[in-house]
């Protein structure tokens, strides 16, 4: 089959599928298209995954290119690293495979770049402008399990026709992801429809066993059942519905309980009434009627705008006083006509700006030039795992300067709507002291960290404390805390506790694997834990500090005014890199776990840029651990940590990741 035919095609294994979409799209458009189907741009990190991509793409024309999920921000070259400073759209830089078309060449990397795969030959990786609409894109879909393709039977009229959850229809699959449908036509004129479902004994399998084209019972017309047909011991047939549906009064068809539900915005099947209602980004359930949604006033959040804030239904906007103009981040204000100030542009332009040369910015800001961002994907941890945050922070400043931490992007406009999926919407509010320990390289001892001063109203951008956006799923109803509030005694101004409030986003299906954003912070190691989540709950985990894909509808606002707290040492195993191109391999380094008590700040060994590789070092079964790269020699490690009552909760190791630039007034990051 010609992959450049009009129709998309896919190749699936037992746990993931790659799909080729021959549609001309920019990188951002391609990324969104994959996300809307519940996947991501392809991230072929191993030779085995690359092999599957190769077989899917086949021998296409040399003139055609396909986006894969690699992107690099302006001025973020790291030519000695396997991914050269590029970051997967899942947020990390972990890889055991590269296929660059050319050896790395020195250069300033003045602009944002994205990676496309050649459709011909070796399917080499080429970098180029993210705003170019190339010929197509490769998506990747992960899932909990897959059903093997059905064996052809003697009575079949033709091969089974499969429809995947990401809407690809084909007869060519070897594996079918959980949720796929198989339609089998029999020569006798009847047919059968099967669903790849979870099995009671565990794993997934087809909703019925063969033979499909013989006998009676469920065989003719699926026993008249819309979804599943069950042949009882006495020979009669009963019908069942797949999860999220209920059997209608006729005992055969299945109905969606949300179809007639009185939800104003979003509905999820399940619960005592058969459904529950939820609200979109910028709204919350009305207290008097949970079916209705009322606007959230984001302007009540301290520091959401530098000067003026106007709330409106579903969002807000920042404004500046006369003589000032709104900066590109949509939050900060600068004197009118000041270098670097930029009028608001078309949103599409802002999302994928190819990088400007802003040479008047001071070095520390330019080195960071990132925003606090929400993590977009569906990130599930093991049930014992508390939520993890990573705070991007780069304390590489001149001696006489205080750290500069940028404001984030407000989450506006609302992200692309996703299919209806489980969504819970309580608010967790915790007031705890955040303590900061930064060990500056020039200090005589790791035990004498500087204190980052507290913020004051109307500070300059150089001295602003971040507002950090993040996302969490709600707890199951049995664990919903409503509002938790933990107060602590008053402290001096330099030790103000942070306000952490979380809104819980709409989730995608829980079968997606964790994705971590680009938290590249040049030598800064940061970890934050949120207390109070029951140890048997599996929360969504969001890592902060990257330019990343959208899709995480709600935001956590973390206002940090710091006191001191220890570094959390972690073990970081190294990863070998396979490369098809003549790139000299990076040396591997393994950082041993510190043996000191966690209460003492610990400096990890200084690593130079020439001897690093991208380790995959999960501390928990589903967590990635991107290690922070270093662009300018040793710099301090910073840990932000909120102690957790759950004794099983270990801090997540941070490994290699990439520093991102920020987009404007939007929660959709790449």
């Amino acid at each position: 089959q010609d992959p450049w035919a009009a129709e998309p095609r896919a190749a699936c294994g037992p746990s993931s599928c790659y799909a080729l979409f021959p549609r001309r799209r920019t990188f951002l458009e391609a990324w969104r298209a994959c996300r809307e189907l519940g996947g991501d741009l392809a991230t072929p990190r191993t030779p085995e995954e690359a092999q599957r991509v190769d077989s899917l793409v086949g021998a296409g024309p040399a003139s055609r290119l396909l986006w894969i999920g690699l992107q690099r921000q302006a001025r973020q070259c790291q030519l000695q690293r396997p991914l050269r400073g590029f970051t997967w759209t899942t947020g990390d830089q972990d890889t055991a495979f590269t296929n660059w078309a050319q050896p790395a060449s020195g250069g300033p990397c003045p602009a944002q770049r994205c990676v496309a795969l050649e459709a011909s030959g070796e399917h080499r990786w080429l970098e180029g402008s993210c705003t170019l609409a190339v010929d197509g894109y490769l998506c990747q879909f992960g899932f909990e399990g897959a059903c093997p393709a059905l064996q052809d039977e003697a009575g079949q009229a033709g091969p089974a026709v499969y429809t995947t959850p990401f809407h690809l229809v084909s007869t060519e699959f070897e594996w079918l992801p959980f949720g796929s449908v198989a339609a089998v036509q029999c020569q006798a004129g009847r047919g059968a429809s099967l669903l790849c479902v979870k099995q009671p004994e565990g794993g997934v399998g087809w909703s019925r066993a063969g033979p499909l084209c013989l006998g009676t019972g469920c065989s003719p017309d699926n026993g008249g059942c819309e979804h599943e047909c069950v042949e009882e011991v006495d020979g009669h047939v009963s019908c069942r519905c797949t999860e999220g549906f209920r059997l209608a009064a006729d005992g055969r068809s299945c109905e969606d309980p949300c179809a007639q539900a009185p939800c104003e915005q979003q509905c999820e099947p399940g619960g005592p009434q058969g459904y529950s209602c939820h609200c979109r980004l910028g709204f919350r359930p009305a207290e008097d009627d949970p079916h209705r949604c009322v606007d959230t006033d984001e302007c009540q959040i301290a520091g959401v705008c530098q000067q003026m804030c106007v709330n409106y239904v579903g969002g807000f906007e920042c404004y500046c006083s006369e003589g000032h103009e709104l900066e590109a981040d949509g939050i900060s204000c600068s004197p009118a006509g000041a270098m670097g100030a930029q009028a608001s542009q078309d949103l599409g332009d802002e999302l994928l700006d190819d990088g400007e040369d802003e040479e008047d910015e001071d070095e520390a800001w330019k080195a960071f030039n990132g925003g606090w961002t929400e993590m977009p994907g569906i990130l599930w941890m093991e049930p014992t795992q508390p939520p993890d945050f990573a705070l991007a922070y780069r304390p590489s400043f001149p001696e006489d300067r205080e750290p500069q931490i940028p404001y984030p992007e407000p989450t506006w406009p609302p992200p692309l709507s996703a299919p209806r999926v489980p969504y819970h919407s309580s608010v967790l509010s915790v007031t705890r002291p955040v303590v900061v320990s930064a060990t500056h390289p020039t200090l005589p001892s790791a035990h004498q960290p500087p204190v980052i001063p507290a913020t004051h109203p109307a500070l300059s951008r150089d001295h602003q404390i971040p507002v950090i956006a993040a996302n969490y799923p709600d707890l199951p109803s049995a664990y919903q805390p409503g509002i938790l509030s933990v107060s602590h005694s008053a402290q001096p101004p330099a030790h103000q506790p942070p306000m952490i409030s979380t809104k819980y986003p709409e989730l995608f299906p829980a079968h997606q694997s964790p994705m971590f954003p680009d938290t590249r912070v040049a030598g800064t190691q940061t970890t934050t834990h949120l207390p109070g989540i029951p140890p048997n709950h599996a929360p969504l985990v969001t890592t902060l500090g990257a330019q990343l894909p959208p899709q995480a509808p709600d935001a956590l606002v973390l206002r940090t005014q710091a006191t001191q707290l220890p570094i959390i040492p972690t073990a970081q195993p190294s990863l070998t890199t396979t490369s098809r191109s003549p790139v000299s391999p990076a040396h591997q380094i393994s950082v041993p776990a510190a043996t000191q008590p966690a209460a003492l700040p610990t400096l990890l060994p200084s690593q130079s840029p020439t001897n690093q590789t991208s380790p995959i070092s999960p501390t928990h079964p589903h967590s990635k651990a991107p290690q922070i790269p270093r662009e300018d020699g040793p710099s301090p490690k910073l840990a932000l940590w909120l102690p957790s009552p759950a004794p099983t909760a270990a801090p997540t190791a941070l490994g290699e990741a990439g520093l991102a630039e920020h987009s404007q007034r939007d929660d959709r990051w790449l």
Epitope: S63, L126, G128, T131, L132
Partner: antibody, heavy 124, light 108 residues
Framework: QVQLVQSGAEVKKPGASVKLSCKAS????????IHWVRQTPGQRLEWMGY????????TYNQKFKGRVTITGDTSANTAYMELNSLTSEDTAVYYC?????????????????WGQGTLVTVSS | DIQLTQSPSFLSASVGDRVTITCRAS??????VAWYQQKPGKAPKLLIY???NRYTGVPSRFSGSGSGTEFTLTISSLQSEDLATYYC??????????FGQGTKLEIK
Amino acid sequence: QVQLVQSGAEVKKPGASVKLSCKASGYTFTDYVIHWVRQTPGQRLEWMGYINPYDDDTTYNQKFKGRVTITGDTSANTAYMELNSLTSEDTAVYYCARRGNSYDGYFDYSMDYWGQGTLVTVSS
Amino acid sequence: DIQLTQSPSFLSASVGDRVTITCRASQNVGTAVAWYQQKPGKAPKLLIYSASNRYTGVPSRFSGSGSGTEFTLTISSLQSEDLATYYCQQYTNYPMYTFGQGTKLEIK
């Protein structure tokens, strides 16, 4: 070496059609897209459309409202551009140009090789 | 459609001079911009692609910069053979290419 050689100058009357050719050599014809660009007497360059000889995929500039047709003959390594319903405004030099695929590990859609151009004069 | 505006339209400079030509786009085109040199009676030749990358065989005195909406072609030390008209081109909404109106460079 890569070469694009275009057919000779044409003089046409208003309302007539013209079909220009562009013969490629020095590379695999089906590996690269061919674009047609014209340059009016005012020196303005104007993109007209392209063909991908691999599968005859074509796209045209809406300005030419169905007056332009680009075709390819892979056996002759030649691309053709036909323009109908000519008017004096169509008097121009017509270029074929190859779209690059990648340079030194970068992908890019600039035009790396151009034909020498064909002057088409439309006059009554 | 995306419009490209070059300035100046006409430029006269001496051998050895540093020459700068600007191209402004009506909307963000990222780095999907190329610069071409067209000598009298000849076809255009590619100089710079992707805003700042020098094409193979192009002398190092030619350089490009910019992203978004503002782009610059610089000739660091003008040579007599640089007499030509220079065009910028955007292709961010490929395949709909658009060109600037051109800058005619004359040697004093």
